[in-house]
Each structure stands twice: as structure tokens, then as C-alpha cells.
Interface confidence: medium
């Protein structure tokens, strides 16, 4: 059910493209294609190519993205395009000028002197933005989200975007300065992963990050299952980067117990993050006794 045909506006197309990209990434990383047939991988790649081509129709002259060409470009959506295209670049041919043009726009047009990324064109499909939808601590969570996207594009774009390392450092410094005052577990998790990517998730931030976990296994807000899956997935990625393999098993167990296999309204971020995190887990912890995921993927019938 994750391998779907992308369609619609610049936001809907990304909603459709997300699950296919992450499903292929997950099955590649965990070497599970034999369950579905290797020919299915090729079909999935065709859908990703289609999504990529369709998304280019929403690229504005500035290299940024919006739901429609007559709307102001969105910081969040452009960062998300960067994130998905960076992952897809391992699967299909992505024009680096397209990807790095979006990175350049984020840095030159949307980053303030204090390192914060600002949003001047909020997305229409608010259900696609996950835990960021809660307006509290939006500056930190958006800055962390963009920073993570920039880090994921770094290998491809560092040569084309001279200001990329400096931008990442500025954003990281802002997150560091704000981190100890964060209240939302979601923000603590996403910002914690952003810091971990910079090798800065150390004391006192590490203690705050770990202490925010409820019962040592989840970064949770009441009655927000999708946000909690997303947040805990960010946290798992941070723990894996830290090589804190003692803290990892209870987190993986909790994610596994959610029996969340993606898809459904409002699931874009939770789907992307849970499969990114579990793929990374199975790569970093090959002897993964804590994970027994019965994942099923369905290709659309032609």
C-alpha cells in the first residue's frame, strides 16, 4: 500500500511520491525485494521517476516549490523536496542543479542572520507536515527540519553551494541556543537529530534529549500517534548516530509495537521517518533481535 502513483499539485505530488521513495529505500537497505519480486522494484522506480518529473512542473524560477506556480514558495515544502530528492538520488537520476538550486534558495532567501529559517508560504496540505503542524516551537522545528534536509543534500550539493557549511553551522548554533528551553517532545526529538547530525548532541543537550523520552522508549505527546511515531523515529536516528546501542532496543520495540506501516491521511512524515529510521537500524544493528516487522507493500494495478 506504500507504492503509489504520485499525482496532483506540488504538495499532493510529494505526498504521493514519499511512500514509494521510502519503501524502495527500506527494501533496498534491508535486502527484502525477494519477498515481492525484483521486477516490482523496477515498477516502483518508474513511479518515482514519474513523481520527480511531475514535481519539476512546480519548480519556480527561484528553484523553490509551492503547491501551485502562482503561490508564494514554501520553505517547508522546498526543504521536503530537497529531502526526498536527496534520498531518491540514490535510486534514479536527479538533476543536481535542481536539487542544489533549492538548497541555495533556502540558504540565501529564507535563512535569517540568527540561523532561523522562516516560512513565508505555508503549505496548503497541512496534513503532510507532521508534528510541525503544531505551531508551538515552530522556529526550532522548522529550522531543524531544514537543517536535516541540508545535511542530507550535503554530499551532492557541497561543491555547488559554497555557503552550505556555514548555513548548517548557523542553524545548528540557533538550535543549540534554544534546545534546553524546548517543551514539546516532538521538537526535542527533531532538533536532537539535527544536532546529532552535526556531532553536537552532547551534554547538556544529550541529557535533555534522553530525559524527554517517556519510559525510555518514546518521544510522546498525548493523543498524537502519528506525531509520536515521527518524533520517535527522529530520536531513533539520533541514537543510531550516537552509537548508543544500549538505548536503541526499547525505542525500536516501541516503534514495532505501534504496528504502523505507513499510509493514510496525514501520514506523510510518519511514514517517511519510521521507514528511514528502521532501515538505518537494520543497517547499523545487523543482528536486530528487537525487530520483527511484517511489512507489506502493494503496487497499484495497471
Amino acid at each position: 500500500h506504500l507504492i503509489v502513483t504520485p499525482a496532483g499539485c506540488g504538495e499532493q505530488n510529494m505526498i504521493g511520491m514519499t511512500p514509494t521513495v521510502i519503501a524502495v529505500h527500506y527494501l533496498d537497505q534491508t535486502e527484502q525485494w525477494e519477498k515481492f519480486g525484483i521486477e516490482k522494484r523496477q515498477e516502483a522506480l518508474e513511479l518515482i521517476k514519474k513523481g520527480y518529473t511531475q514535481q519539476l512542473a512546480f519548480k519556480q524560477p527561484s528553484s523553490a516549490y509551492a503547491a501551485f506556480n502562482n503561490r508564494p514558495p514554501s520553505t517547508w515544502l522546498t526543504a521536503y523536496v530537497v529531502k526526498v530528492f536527496s534520498l531518491a538520488a540514490n535510486l534514479i537520476a536527479i538533476d543536481s542543479h535542481v536539487l542544489c538550486g533549492a538548497v541555495k534558495w533556502l540558504i540565501l532567501e529564507k535563512q535569517k542572520p540568527d540561523g532561523v529559517f522562516q516560512e513565508d508560504g505555508p503549505v496548503i496540505h497541512q496534513e503532510m507536515i507532521g508534528g510541525f503542524r503544531n505551531a508551538k516551537e515552530a522556529d526550532v522545528s522548522l529550522t531543524a527540519f531544514v537543517l536535516i534536509a541540508l545535511q542530507e543534500a550535503r554530499d551532492i550539493c557541497e561543491g555547488q553551494v559554497n555557503s552550505l557549511p556555514g548555513s548548517i553551522n548557523k542553524a545548528g548554533e540557533y538550535i543549540e541556543a534554544s534546545y534546553m528551553n524546548l517543551q514539546r517532545p516532538y521538537t526535542v526529538a527533531i532538533a536532537g537529530y539535527a544536532l546529532a547530525l552535526m556531532n553536537k548532541l552532547e551534554e547538556p543537550y544529550l541529557g535533555k534529549f534522553l530525559n524527554t523520552a517517556k519510559d525510555r522508549n518514546r518521544w510522546e505527546e498525548p493523543d498524537q500517534q502519528l506525531y509520536n511515531v515521527e518524533a520517535t523515529s527522529y530520536a531513533l536516528l539520533a541514537l543510531l548516530l550516537l552509537k548508543d546501542f544500549d538505548s536503541v532496543p526499547p525505542v525500536v520495540r516501541w516503534l514495532n509495537e505501534q504496528r504502523y506501516y505507513g499510509g493514510g491521511y496525514g501520514s506523510t512524515q510518519a511514514t517517511f521517518m519510521v521507514f528511514q529510521a528502521l532501515a538505518q537500524y537494520q543497517t547499523d544493528v545487523p543482528d536486530h533481535k528487537d525487530l520483527n516487522m511484517d511489512v507489506s507493500f502493494h503496487l497499484p494495478s495497471r
Partner: antibody
Amino acid sequence: QSLEESGGRLVTPGTPLTLTCTVSGFSLSTYTLGWVRQAPGKGLEYIGWIDSSGSAYYASWAKGRFTISKASSTTVDLKMAGLTTEDTATYFCASGNTGGDPLYYGMDPWGPGTLVTVSS
Amino acid sequence: DPVLTQTPSSTSAAVGGTVTIKCQASQNIGRWLAWYQQKPGQPPKLLIYRASDLASGVPSRFKGSGSGTQFTLTISGVQREDAATYYCLGSYSSSDSAFGGGTEVVVK
């Protein structure tokens, strides 16, 4: 930084009792506080702790019978119900070492303790 | 609740010697373990937190190690003032935490 427990006394079984931990030199609005007890001649037993926002966490055996609450920025109460002779112990309060979870950063410093005796 | 098994329950060492105390958790507790020292008639004192981090003001002869389920407190170059009972406190979650049974250290 110092802590002091008060309220310990001789009570009969079933009598509720509230102990108070008073801190000086720091504020509970930024620090956590834990409770531990020790029966005469026995080892230490963890009861629970309260974070700076007032959320309390308990050892599973203490849930329901013990309640930790913040009375002010310098005092925390430990309310005990349904006391039995098994609850006879010295009760200690201790601050979280850094303001974080005392189970992660450890508890330091400690109060001198207050003795609760449950006897018929 | 996790069970923390401390061994030995009692040990002795000469001044300048080495003492090793082990704490085994019944389930993986990562690095969520602290060591405390208690002398008769006094409250406990924090020695080590997060399995291996030395608390402020604690002499460097105290060393904590381990993670997961196996932890060790080592006192190298034991001094007379180290005679005390030592406890580990492990935490699997906020509601699953327990002390070990204690180890009495006698200095000869």
C-alpha cells in the same frame, strides 16, 4: 544547596502521613527531586521522583499508595496512605544532580532523612 | 521491575588495595545506572552517574564501567574512609527502577 525532610513520626497502621522536603539554595522550578527510603538495618528502596514541571514518576510498588507533589518552589510533599508496619523506615529526599532525571544524572545532595515508625 | 543483583554482599581490602563490586541488571538498562556510598547514620552520597561519569568532588580512585546489564564499580588504592556500604541504582524506565542489595566494604 541543602535539603531537609520533616513530618516523620510514630503512626498506627492505616493512618495517612505526609512528609515534606524543604530545599534551600536552589529552586524546584528548575530542579528535580527524588524520594528513597531505608528500613532499619536494610538496603535502600527507590520510591519516585518529581520533575521541575510537577510531573511525578513512581516505582511500580509505590503507585497508588504514595503521591509526590510540589507544594511550592522550595517544598515537595510525599503523601503516604494505607501505611503498614512494612513502611517503617527512614525516608530521604534528594535533588537531581543537574536538574535532569535523577535516575540518569543521579541524586545529589541528600537530606539527613526523617524516621517514620508504623506500629500498633 | 528490574532486579539489580549486587555481588559480593560483603568484601574487605587492605589500605591501598583494590575493591571490585558488580551489579547485574535483569534487563537492559543502557547506561541508566548510578553508584552510591552510604556510611552508618548518614544519607547516601552519589559517586557515579550514567554508569561511568564521576560525580563532582568524588576522588578519581572510584571508577564505574559497563552498560546494558553488567556494571562494575572499582575502587583503586582503597583508603580507610572508603569503608561503607555501596549501592547501585538502575533504571529501565521512570517506573521501573531499583537499588541493588548493597555491598559492605571493610577496610583492614
